[in-house]
C-alpha cells in the first residue's frame, strides 16, 4: 500500500503535486508499512477495541487563515476517555478518585509503556530497532525523552505527508510559500504503541485557508456608545478604530504597514502607519467605512526582465505580475502581487487586506455634568439619613433614564444602585434626589441613558454628620 491509499481520498492533480512542495514533507506515493501500522477502514469493528475504556478523540485546529508565504500551525490534541490522562513518563494512567462507568480502577495504568519499552527492545543500547520506525520506514528521531512519546501522528495534505512522534498533543508548522491559494484539507491519522507494532486510534480532518489577502479585523469603540457591537455610533463623539491583523506566525513583523481609510462622509482619504485612528462623524446617517491595509512582505523575486532592444527604453526594475487567484480585487493599483526588486535578490511583495463596514450615526447623549449638590433638610424621625439633590445638565440628545450607583470612596464596592425613567425638557436640566445612610465619603456614579447612548459622570462627596452647621462638600469631580 502507498500513503495515499491509507490517508485520504483527495487526490491532487499532478500540477498541484508539483507546485505545492512543502519543505520537509514527503510524497504520498511512498510505501506504507502495513505490518507495523495496520490500516482499518471506517466502520471496521477493530476500532472499537483500539483503546482501553472507550474511544480516543483527536481534535485538529489551525491558526488559519494564513497569508501566503507565512507559516500555518496545526495542533492536534488527543482527548482520552473519562478518568484517563498521560503521566509525566508518557504512560496513560487512571486519574485518582475518578469514577467512570467501570467504577474505580485497581490498576493505576491504562497503558504502561515504560514497562514495555524496558523489556521488549533488544536494541543493543542504541535505542534503534526494526520497530522504532515511522510508517515509511524512517527511524524515530532520538530527542531526549523520545521513549516517553507513544503516539505517532501522520499529517497529510496536498499529496504529501509528515510524520511526527509525540505525546498527547503535538503541533506542526508548515510554510505556505508554495501552497495554492484557497481552502485546503489537512488530514491526521494517529497511532499508539502496541508492543512492537502500532494501532490506529483516531483520524481527524480540517479545512485550512491560504490567502493572498491580509486577514484584517477592525474593532470600534466610542465613549457613551451603549452597544459597541451593533455598528451604530453617536454623532459628534470620536470613534476609535483599532486594526487587528491576523498574523500568528509574525510574517509581517518586519513589514512596513500602511492603513488607508475612507470614512464615507466626504472627508477624503486618511493614510496612516498607526493601527489605531480616531474619527468623528458630524452628520447623522449611514456611512460606508473602507480600509485598505498594505504591507510590504518578503517574497520571491520576479524573473529578470528580458534584455532591452536597442530601440526601446530599458524596462523599469519594478515588475507587476497579474494575480489570477486574488479573491477580492483591490482598488486600482492595489494588485496583491506587486513585486519590487531590491538589491541582492531579496524582494518584497505588496500584500493587501481590505475591511468594509456600514456604520449608522445617530444623536446621542454626549456629556453629563453635575453642576450643583444640595443637602435637603430631613424631618426629625430620620436623623441618620441625608437627602441630597444633584442638579445635572447634559448635551446632545434627551435622556430617558437616569441611574445612580453609590459606592465606597474607591468606587469599587457598590452599596446602592437606583435607576428611574426621566422626563427632561429641551434644556436638559434635571434634579436627581438620592438618600445616603450615614455620614462619610461616597463615590457617586451618575449615568444618563437613551436607546443608543449612556453618558457617565462621577464625583466623590463628603456627607457630614447631621449637624446643620456642617456644609455638604463635593470632594472632587
Amino acid at each position: 500500500k502507498r500513503f495515499h491509499d491509507v490517508l485520504g481520498n483527495e487526490r491532487p492533480s499532478a500540477y498541484m503535486r508539483e507546485h505545492n512542495q512543502l519543505n520537509g514533507w514527503s510524497s504520498d506515493e511512498n510505501d506504507w508499512n502495513e505490518k507495523l501500522y495496520p490500516v482499518w477502514k471506517r466502520g471496521d469493528m477493530r476500532w472499537k477495541n483500539s483503546w482501553k475504556g472507550g474511544r480516543v478523540q483527536a481534535v485538529l485546529t489551525s491558526d488559519s487563515p494564513a497569508l501566503v508565504g507565512s507559516n500555518i500551525t496545526f495542533a492536534v490534541n488527543l482527548i482520552f476517555p473519562r478518568c484517563q490522562k498521560e503521566d509525566a513518563n508518557g504512560n496513560i494512567v487512571y486519574e485518582k478518585n475518578c469514577r467512570n462507568e467501570a467504577g474505580l480502577s485497581a490498576d493505576p495504568y491504562v497503558y504502561n509503556w515504560t514497562a514495555w519499552s524496558e523489556d521488549s527492545d533488544g536494541e543493543n543500547g542504541t535505542g534503534q530497532s526494526h520497530h522504532n520506525v515511522f510508517p515509511d520506514g524512517k527511524p524515530f528521531p532520538h530527542h531526549p525523552g523520545w521513549r516517553r512519546w507513544n503516539f505517532i501522528y501522520v499529517f497529510h495534505t496536498l499529496g504529501q505527508y509528515f510524520q511526527k512522534l509525540g505525546r498527547c498533543s503535538v503541533r506542526v508548522s508548515v510554510n505556505t510559500a508554495n501552497v495554492t491559494l484557497g481552502p485546503q484539507l489537512m488530514e491526521v491519522t494517529v497511532y499508539r504503541r502496541h508492543g512492537r507494532a502500532y494501532v490506529p486510534i483516531a483520524q481527524v480532518k480540517d479545512v485550512y485557508v491560504v490567502t493572498d489577502q491580509i486577514p484584517v479585523f477592525v474593532t470600534m469603540f466610542q465613549k457613551n456608545d451603549r452597544n459597541s457591537s451593533d455598528e451604530t455610533f453617536l454623532k459628534d463623539l470620536p470613534i476609535m478604530f483599532d486594526v487587528l491583523i491576523h498574523d500568528p506566525s509574525h510574517f509581517l513583523n518586519y513589514s512596513t504597514i500602511n492603513y488607508k481609510w475612507s470614512f464615507g462622509d466626504n472627508t477624503g482619504l486618511f493614510v496612516s502607519t498607526n493601527h489605531t485612528v480616531n474619527h468623528t462623524y458630524v452628520l447623522n446617517g449611514t456611512f460606508s467605512l473602507n480600509l485598505t491595509v498594505k504591507a510590504a512582505a518578503p517574497g520571491p523575486c520576479p524573473p529578470p526582465p528580458p534584455p532591452p532592444r536597442p530601440s526601446k527604453p530599458t524596462p523599469s526594475l519594478a515588475t507587476t505580475l497579474k494575480s489570477y487567484d486574488s479573491n477580492t480585487p483591490g482598488p486600482a493599483g492595489d494588485n496583491p502581487l506587486e513585486l519590487s526588486r531590491i538589491p541582492d535578490e531579496n524582494c518584497q511583495i505588496n500584500r493587501y487586506g481590505h475591511f468594509q463596514a456600514t456604520i449608522t450615526i445617530v444623536e446621542g447623549i454626549l456629556e453629563v455634568n453635575i453642576i450643583q449638590m444640595t443637602d435637603v433638610l430631613m424631618p426629625v424621625p430620620w436623623p441618620e439619613s441625608s437627602l441630597i439633590d444633584f442638579v445635572v445638565t447634559c448635551q446632545g440628545s434627551i435622556p430617558t433614564e437616569v441611574c445612580t450607583i453609590i459606592s465606597d470612596p474607591t468606587c469599587e464596592i457598590t452599596q446602592n444602585t437606583v435607576c428611574s425613567p426621566v422626563d427632561v425638557d429641551e434644556m436638559c436640566l434635571l434634579t436627581v434626589r438620592r438618600t445616603f445612610n450615614g455620614s462619610g465619603t461616597y463615590c457617586v456614579n451618575l449615568t444618563l441613558g437613551d436607546d443608543t447612548s449612556l453618558a457617565l459622570t462621577s464625583t466623590l462627596i463628603s456627607v457630614p454628620d447631621r449637624d446643620p452647621a456642617s456644609p455638604l462638600r463635593m470632594a472632587n469631580s
Epitope: N89, G125, P144, G145, G166, R167, C168, S169
Partner: antibody, heavy 121, light 104 residues
Framework: QVQLVESGGGVVQPGRSLRLSCAAS????????IHWVRQAPGKGLEWVAV????????YYADSVKGRFTISRDNSKNTLYLQMNSLRAEDAAVYYC??????????????WGQGTLVTVSS | LTQSPSSLSASVRDRVTITCRAS??????LAWYQQKPGKVPNLLIY???TLQSGVPSRFSGSGSGTDFTLTISSLQPEDVATYYC?????????FGGGTKVEIK
C-alpha cells in the same frame, strides 16, 4: 537573545500564598516546555514543576504536588507559579528554565536570574 | 544521583574529574551544569558527552548507563564553581548533590 526574567518573590508567612511570574523574550515561547527549579540557600538544585509548550500537561515534584500550580500565557510570553500553603522548606531562589524541547522532558538550556522566596513567621 | 566528591581543591592547570552515579540505567540521558558563586546555573554538557555551544573545550563528559564523568582538562581560575549532574531519562527530573571546585 533568549531572556527569562522572574518576579513576584518576597517575604511571606507560612500557610500564605505567593505568585511568581517569568517573562520570556528572544525565542518563540509557545514552542518550548518551561520548568521551575528552586535552590534553598546554600543547598543544591531541586526541580519543582514543568509545563508543556501548549500548557496542556503539567507535572510536579512530590514535595509541591497539590500546593503549587504552574501555568502559562503564550499570548503574553509569560510563565507563572502559584504557590499556596507555603512552608518553611519552600524558602528558596526560584528559577524559571527553558527546556530545549516542547514537552519539557529533558534538560535546561537557559535560566532566569531567579527570584527569592522567604517563608517566615 | 550520587555525585562525588562533594568538594575538591586543585591547582590551576590540573586535570579535574567529577563523577555522577545513577541508581539505575539512564542510558546517556545526563546533563552537567556549572554554577558560579552568586550566579545562575549554566548548561555545560547534555546527552552525557555533547558540549553545549559556547562552552570551552576543556570541559568534556563521558559515560553511559549508570556511571558518568565530567572532566576539566586544565583547571582555570574562572572554573571555581559548584557542578551539578541531572538525569532526564524519566520523571521526575533530578539533580546530583553538587561538587564544589576550589583552587588550591
Amino acid at each position: 537573545q533568549v531572556q527569562l526574567v522572574e518576579s513576584g518573590g518576597g517575604v511571606v508567612q507560612p500557610g500564605r500564598s505567593l505568585r511568581l511570574s517569568c517573562a520570556a523574550s528572544g525565542f518563540t515561547f509557545s514552542n518550548y516546555g518551561i520548568h521551575w527549579v528552586r535552590q534553598a540557600p546554600g543547598k543544591g538544585l531541586e526541580w519543582v514543576a514543568v509545563i508543556w509548550f501548549d500548557g496542556r500537561n503539567k507535572y510536579y515534584a512530590d514535595s509541591v504536588k497539590g500546593r503549587f500550580t504552574i501555568s502559562r500565557d503564550n499570548s503574553k510570553n509569560t510563565l507563572y507559579l502559584q504557590m499556596n500553603s507555603l512552608r518553611a522548606e519552600d524558602a528558596a531562589v526560584y528559577y524559571c528554565a527553558r527546556d530545549p524541547f516542547d514537552y519539557g522532558d529533558s534538560f535546561f538550556d537557559y535560566w532566569g536570574q531567579g527570584t527569592l522566596v522567604t517563608v517566615s513567621s | 544521583l550520587t555525585q562525588s566528591p562533594s568538594s575538591l581543591s586543585a591547582s590551576v592547570r590540573d586535570r579535574v574529574t567529577i563523577t555522577c552515579r545513577a541508581s539505575q540505567d539512564i542510558s546517556n540521558y545526563l546533563a552537567w551544569y556549572q554554577q558560579k558563586p552568586g550566579k545562575v546555573p549554566n548548561l555545560l554538557i547534555y546527552a552525557a558527552s555533547t558540549l553545549q555551544s559556547g562552552v570551552p573545550s576543556r570541559f568534556s563528559g563521558s559515560g553511559s548507563g549508570t556511571d558518568f564523568t565530567l572532566t576539566i582538562s586544565s583547571l582555570q581560575p574562572e572554573d571555581v564553581a559548584t557542578y551539578y549532574c541531572q538525569k532526564y531519562n524519566s520523571a521526575p527530573l533530578t539533580f546530583g548533590g553538587g561538587t564544589k571546585v576550589e583552587i588550591k
